[in-house]
């Protein structure tokens, strides 16, 4: 931009150098050149000479008018045509910006990733503002009434050391720019309810050579949380439909989950967990790929109607990826329930 230009006059913008996108804008240029009575005053936008809607107000001043200015940024400068000068003479320049006041931040979520030592809050910022916009995160203790504020750009990590005095907080986000301010809805947070267990990892898988081969998937987490509820989703690499199994897990030892899968197929497994009864899920773990062994006696096999599906305290359901381009976005299509209640409807990816 033109920030350190030596002006021989002045340039100003109405309604201001930062204005709401779509507004009508007037830009004025006033020369104060020595030894020059300009024949003409010219306006340039981003280096290109403007031809239309220019008015000469008096000997020293001209104005250019823009109807419904909608460019986020422009570099304006004006020049004078001085008699006897071969080149135009620079008068002044200005950076101008147009944008929108911020939307109210929405979908405010705060979580504590186990062992991180931070409460991480995220939100949706809404439509682009095109101008510098700050986010102020307010954290108010419901017990001591003390309020803290944090400046953020799109998320904030707040050390749990600064949240020692209380367990219950009110959190909200203020979006601020030069065109306006909006507040999010307030979020009630209890620190004990927002912990997400330490990452779950699938470490290995093996398929047995039994008459009915079974695949055992081994998975673990370093979590110290006692009651953990997990989902494992799995599908062949050629399929778009995931099956989901639910587990109550105790990570004092490595978890083993048994599956009766189609032979000679490549499967993808992912797992995620949450503290039992809480709402925040881990992101799905990294995809773990396992090739099942070939079977001698072939049969037409359906993993969700087979009598060989291992049934313990799990629920199995199906979810289908919306498109092959978005394998992580899940939508519940149908649920074939083997036991207990349907799988959690919250099958979208968090991570």
């Amino acid at each position: 931009g033109i920030t350190s230009i030596n002006c021989s006059g002045d340039m100003w913008v109405e309604p201001g150098e930062i204005f709401q996108m779509g507004m009508n804008v007037s830009i004025y240029c006033q020369e104060a050149l020595k030894h020059c009575r300009p024949r003409n005053l010219y306006f340039y936008k981003n280096g290109f000479k403007e031809e239309f809607d220019i008015t000469r107000i008096n000997r020293t001043t001209a104005r250019i008018w823009y109807k419904g200015f909608s460019e986020p940024h422009a570099y304006m400068h004006c020049t004078a045509e001085c008699p006897g000068h071969f080149q135009e003479t620079l008068i002044c320049g200005k950076d101008i910006s147009s944008g929108h006041p911020p939307d109210a931040p929405s979908n405010l979520t705060c979580v504590i990733y186990e062992y991180s030592g931070n409460m991480t809050c995220t939100w949706n910022t809404g439509k682009p503002t095109y101008i510098d916009t700050k986010y102020i995160v307010h954290v108010k203790s419901l017990e001591t009434e003390e309020e803290q504020q944090y400046l953020a750009s799109s998320y904030v990590k707040i050390s749990t050391d600064s949240l020692q005095g209380s367990r219950k907080y009110l959190v909200w986000v203020q979006a601020v720019n030069s065109l306006g301010m909006e507040n999010s809805q307030q979020l009630h947070v209890h620190l004990d309810d927002i912990v997400i267990p330490s990452a779950s990892i699938i470490s290995r898988a093996e398929t047995t050579n039994d008459t009915v081969p079974k695949t055992i998937v081994y998975w673990k987490s370093k979590t110290m949380i006692e009651k953990v509820f997990c989902e494992m989703r799995y599908k062949t690499t050629t399929n778009q439909t995931w099956s989901v199994k639910e587990f109550d897990a105790n990570f004092t030892y490595v978890q083993q989950s048994e599956f009766y899968l189609e032979p000679d197929s490549k499967y993808v497994f992912q797992v995620r967990c949450q503290e039992t009864g809480k709402r925040n899920w881990q992101p799905w773990s990294s995809p773990f790929v396992h090739q099942t062994s070939q079977e001698t006696g072939k049969r037409n096999w359906q993993p969700w109607s087979s009598p060989f599906v291992h049934q313990t305290s799990q629920t199995v359901s199906q979810v289908t990826a919306k498109s092959s381009h978005e394998p992580q976005k899940m939508e519940m299509l149908s649920a074939t329930i083997f036991r207990g209640h349907p799988a959690s409807g919250n099958h979208q990816d968090i991570g």
Epitope: T3, D132, T133, K134, Q148, Y150, L151, K157, S162, V176
Partner: nanobody, 116 residues
Framework: QVQLQESGGGSVQAGGSLRLSCAAS????????MGWYRQAPGKERELVSM???????FYADSVKGRFTFSQENAKSTVYLQMNSLKPEDTAMYYC??????????WGQGTQVTVSS
């Protein structure tokens, strides 16, 4: 850690003017997003004005056209020029230094009282 010290408050009649100053000391001042805030008795602290970026300043609707935020980088000082003061402007005024991801640091505040 930055330290902030406000001054310039006082009592004034409605329609009068005051100029608040906030002097910052400490090595982090240059990375501060500076703002003026106020807290009236029994109310939440509210943002009055904030320097968003070069040439871009936020003003609360209630003070737009009456208050002007300015800064003098060489002196690490920011100002709030308050004109056409109203009784509802009566509050404790604080300047704040906010840096990304860190807790906002406040000054001790300066009292502004506007009588009708």
């Amino acid at each position: 850690q930055v330290q902030l010290q406000e001054s310039g408050g006082g009592s004034v009649q409605a329609g009068g003017s005051l100029r608040l100053s906030c002097a910052a000391s400490g090595y982090t001042y240059s990375s501060c997003t500076m703002g003026w805030y106020r807290q009236a008795p029994g109310k939440e602290r509210e943002l009055v004005s904030m320097l968003i970026s070069d040439g871009s300043t936020f003003y609360a609707d209630s003070v737009k056209g009456r208050f002007t935020f300015s800064q003098e980088n060489a002196k690490s000082t920011v100002y709030l020029q308050m004109n056409s003061l109203k009784p509802e402007d009566t509050a404790m005024y604080y300047c704040g230094c906010a840096t990304l991801g860190s807790r906002t640091v406040w000054g001790q505040g300066t009292q502004v009282t506007v009588s009708s």
